[in-house]
């Protein structure tokens, strides 16, 4: 594996610039990234953005194959952290280092016109065993079996309409099917019922992906318990980083400090969603190209 060490100095990135300009700036900076051999860990150090600081002084390190749970209130910077890992947000200070290819499961699931299978494979070469494993782990077997055309059922324009839960599971399956070194899962269970969520968290995130490096944005204590490391963000800063047992020991302290606190992005929900949608669209178009 090659490790891309990303070092950027005095890069100013505003969400206000609009994503188009930001994307072009990120692409220009991409050309200056140096590749060197390194270990298999994902390393973050000292992040901040000039202007409106979306993330400030974030530090964490997760080894290959570990699960990092990222939590925090609305607007704390959880999705922004994932955007930065994907290179869609550029840090003004600090450095990012990670290995190999990234697969991203967005908070807002999407479906393209095409069959169920095409939506999951999404341009990646077909592997029957891998495909069946993913379908099973994402609890899609029963749903697919009910359609007359099974996984050749057409979705989108002129096709059948899926429920929110089915869309979410197909979106997750798409991300998991892609063979990557790092999986970014942005609140993938938001539209799932709790029974399905528990099954998928166990069978997919904990078992099928056990040897993969995973970053899961979640608010669930059950997920935090199973994570190797936990990162809690508050107003763009790292308020806690450590293990669940360490979190339990600290809880009374930071609970009293932050009682009732909640922060929101400076943009409206519509603005945030439009930015994320455009980000996801651009990221999806790059297909299997290594993002690092």
């Amino acid at each position: 594996l090659t490790t891309t060490e990303v070092v950027m100095e005095n890069v100013t990135a505003f969400w206000e610039e609009g994503f188009g300009e930001l994307f072009e700036k990120a692409k220009q900076n991409n050309n200056n990234r140096k590749t060197s051999n390194g270990d298999d860990s994902l390393f973050f150090s000292n992040f901040s953005l000039l202007g409106t600081p979306v993330l400030k002084d974030i530090n964490f390190k997760i080894e290959r194959g570990q699960l990092l749970a990222v939590a925090g209130s609305t607007g704390a910077g959880k999705t922004s952290l994932l955007m930065m890992i994907m290179g869609e947000l550029e840090p003004s200070e600090g450095k990012i280092k990670h290995s190999g290819r990234i697969s991203f499961c967005p908070q807002f699931s999407w479906i393209m016109p095409g069959t169920i299978k095409e939506n999951i494979i999404f341009g990646v070469s077909y592997d029957e065993y891998r495909y069946r494993s993913v379908i099973k782990a994402c609890q899609l077997e029963e749903d697919i079996s009910k359609f007359p055309e099974k996984d050749n059922t057409v979705l989108g324009e002129g096709g059948i309409t899926l429920s929110g839960g089915q869309r979410a599971r197909i979106s997750l399956a798409r991300a998991v099917y892609k063979d990557a070194d790092l999986y970014l899962l942005d609140s993938p269970f938001g539209y799932l019922d709790v029974l399905t969520e528990k099954e998928i968290f166990e069978s997919c995130v904990c078992k099928l992906m056990a040897n993969k490096t995973r970053i899961l944005v979640t608010s669930k204590m059950e997920h935090l318990k199973k994570a190797d490391k936990i990162l809690i963000l508050h107003e763009g800063s790292s308020y806690f980083y450590g293990t669940f047992s360490e979190l339990q020991n600290l809880q009374p302290d930071f609970s009293s400090k932050l009682m009732g606190c909640d922060s929101f992005d400076q943009f409206s929900a519509e603005r945030r969603n439009s930015i994320l949608t455009e980000t996801l669209h651009r990221f999806s178009l790059e297909g299997d190209a290594p993002v690092s």
């Epitope: 019922d193 709790v194 059950e222 935090l224 508050h234 308020y239 009732g260």
Partner: nanobody
């Protein structure tokens, strides 16, 4: 201490309606997803309907078009309006909610379940 209490169950004739309610009480800061699940004798518990904090809904295929889930965030209550009931809807109905207690920081949630309310539909 957080509790979920269901109400509204009972014995009804096929084709009639019932409205279930579930109120969350206790030291609650916020509630994310809420939902209704049911379990018939000898069967596994399964989802009936869920509703997100902002009102997005999802239903089991078997109840689509007949059941409607709604919630009142101010009252920390979720409802299930059940129309055109069938004998196969007979089950114990459980309420579920993802709740952040006042003592929890950063809006971290735990899963809570109600004790269940019996719905029996006779033919």
């Amino acid at each position: 201490q957080v509790q979920l209490q269901e109400s509204g169950g009972g014995l009804v004739q096929a084709g009639s309606s019932l409205r279930l309610a579930c109120a969350a009480t206790g030291s609650i800061r916020s509630i994310n997803n809420m939902g209704w699940y049911r379990q018939a004798p000898g069967k596994q518990r399964g989802m009936v309907a869920i509703i997100t904090r902002v009102g997005n809904t999802d239903y089991a295929d078997s109840v689509k078009g007949r059941f409607t889930i709604s919630r009142d965030n101010a009252k920390n209550t979720v409802y299930l309006q059940m129309n055109s009931l069938k004998p196969e809807d007979t089950a114990t109905y459980y309420c579920h909610a993802e709740i952040t207690e006042q003592s929890r920081p950063f809006y971290l949630t735990d899963d809570y379940w109600g004790q269940g309310t019996q719905v029996t539909v006779s033919s």
